[in-house]
């Protein structure tokens, strides 16, 4: 299968700038935007701190930590109202991502 210029392989994502026009589905990650070409039953998400295609049920149920959004060795916790997640680095620094 040959891909046209700008076309993404199925199941892959790329980071795009906020002002770039695209008809592909997008999900804001921190303040980045990802353009993903996800397979059926998948949706744009975050895995290991990078944009990825994840099971759509994770998004629907807001069980963000099931995406494995944090780096290996970091702990993941849901924000109280499931509006996002925190990654806790070894040593205790936290990084919070909210989903709009």
């Amino acid at each position: 299968q040959f891909l046209k210029e700008g076309q993404l392989a199925a199941g892959t994502c790329e980071i795009v700038t906020l002002d770039r026009d695209s008809s592909q589905p997008r999900r804001t990650i921190a303040r980045q935007t990802a353009r993903c070409a996800c397979r059926k039953g998948q949706i744009a998400g975050t895995t290991r701190n990078k944009p990825s295609c994840v099971d759509a049920r994770i998004i629907k149920t807001k069980q963000w930590c099931d995406m494995l959004p944090c780096l290996e060795g970091e702990g993941c916790d849901l924000l109280i109202n499931r509006s996002g997640w925190t990654c806790t680095q070894p040593g205790g620094r936290i990084k919070t991502t909210t989903v709009s």
Partner: antibody, heavy 114, light 113 residues
Framework: QEQLVESGGRLVTPGTTLTLTCTVS????????VSWVRQAPGKGLEWIGY??????PHYASWAKGRFTISKTSSTTVDLKMTSLTTEDTATYFC?????????WGPGTLVTVSS | ELDLTQTPSSVSAAVGGTVTINCQAS????????LAWYQQKPGQPPKLLIY???TLASGVSSRFKGSGSGTQFTLTISDVQCDDAATYYC?????????????FGGGTELEIL
């Protein structure tokens, strides 16, 4: 609107103990870490320390022992400074420390002079 | 001891020109990319420009570009404007369990000719 405001800065004499307060609004301290940074007049930025929700604070090597960061309420983080010297004269900032430090407070000026 | 060396310490540029500021860390930053850039004007707190080495902060002009990983990072300002006159700082994040969590570079003062 996410905001931080520092208070407590004033003119003190060497040897004094002073506590600065960072009051936050628009976000929760249970979800974000806060760093304290200082800037001596005409000099660069110097990181003092960091505190996250339920974790022990972390300090710059030079700040250990004389500086103490604590979360004093759901909206305030304190910076306690002991045995102040003229070298501690600076504007002290607090900032939400997440993906970079953003936003910052306007700063509070501490002047140590005899 | 953690150290971030910023070069040059001062730089001049004409309106419309391009400026490059370098930041070298004495050890790799966390995840090889946890480095931020700030702009500070006199009497104001620093303003976040770039985080995660290359991600533009919200509301920041795309004339600012960050690159690099590990220990070597660069901030490039293209099509320089009068309003860009300021001091620029890099800030590296490190593992809190093994070292200082954060460190700042010494700053680079940008003068517009």
């Amino acid at each position: 609107q996410e905001q931080l405001v520092e208070s407590g800065g004033r003119l003190v004499t060497p040897g004094t103990t002073l506590t600065l307060t960072c009051t936050v609004s628009g976000f929760s301290l249970s979800s974000y870490g806060v760093s304290w940074v200082r800037q001596a007049p005409g000099k660069g930025l110097e990181w003092i320390g960091y505190i996250a929700n339920n974790y022990n604070p972390h300090y710059a090597s030079w700040a250990k022992g004389r500086f103490t960061i604590s979360k004093t309420s759901s909206t305030t983080v304190d910076l306690k400074m002991t045995s102040l010297t003229t070298e501690d004269t600076a504007t002290y900032f607090c900032a939400r420390d997440n993906y970079g430090m953003d936003p910052w407070g306007p700063g509070t000026l501490v002047t140590v002079s005899s | 001891e953690l150290d971030l060396t910023q070069t040059p310490s001062s730089v001049s540029a004409a309106v419309g020109g391009t400026v490059t500021i370098n930041c070298q860390a004495s050890q790799s930053v966390y995840n090889n990319k946890n480095l931020a850039w700030y702009q500070q004007k006199p009497g104001q707190p620093p303003k976040l420009l770039i985080y995660a080495a290359s991600t533009l902060a919200s509301g920041v002009s795309s004339r600012f570009k960050g690159s690099g990983s590990g220990t070597q990072f660069t901030l490039t300002i293209s099509d320089v404007q009068c309003d860009d006159a300021a001091t620029y700082y890099c800030q590296g994040e490190f593992s809190c369990s093994s070292a200082d969590c954060n460190a700042f570079g010494g700053g680079t003062e940008l003068e517009i000719l």
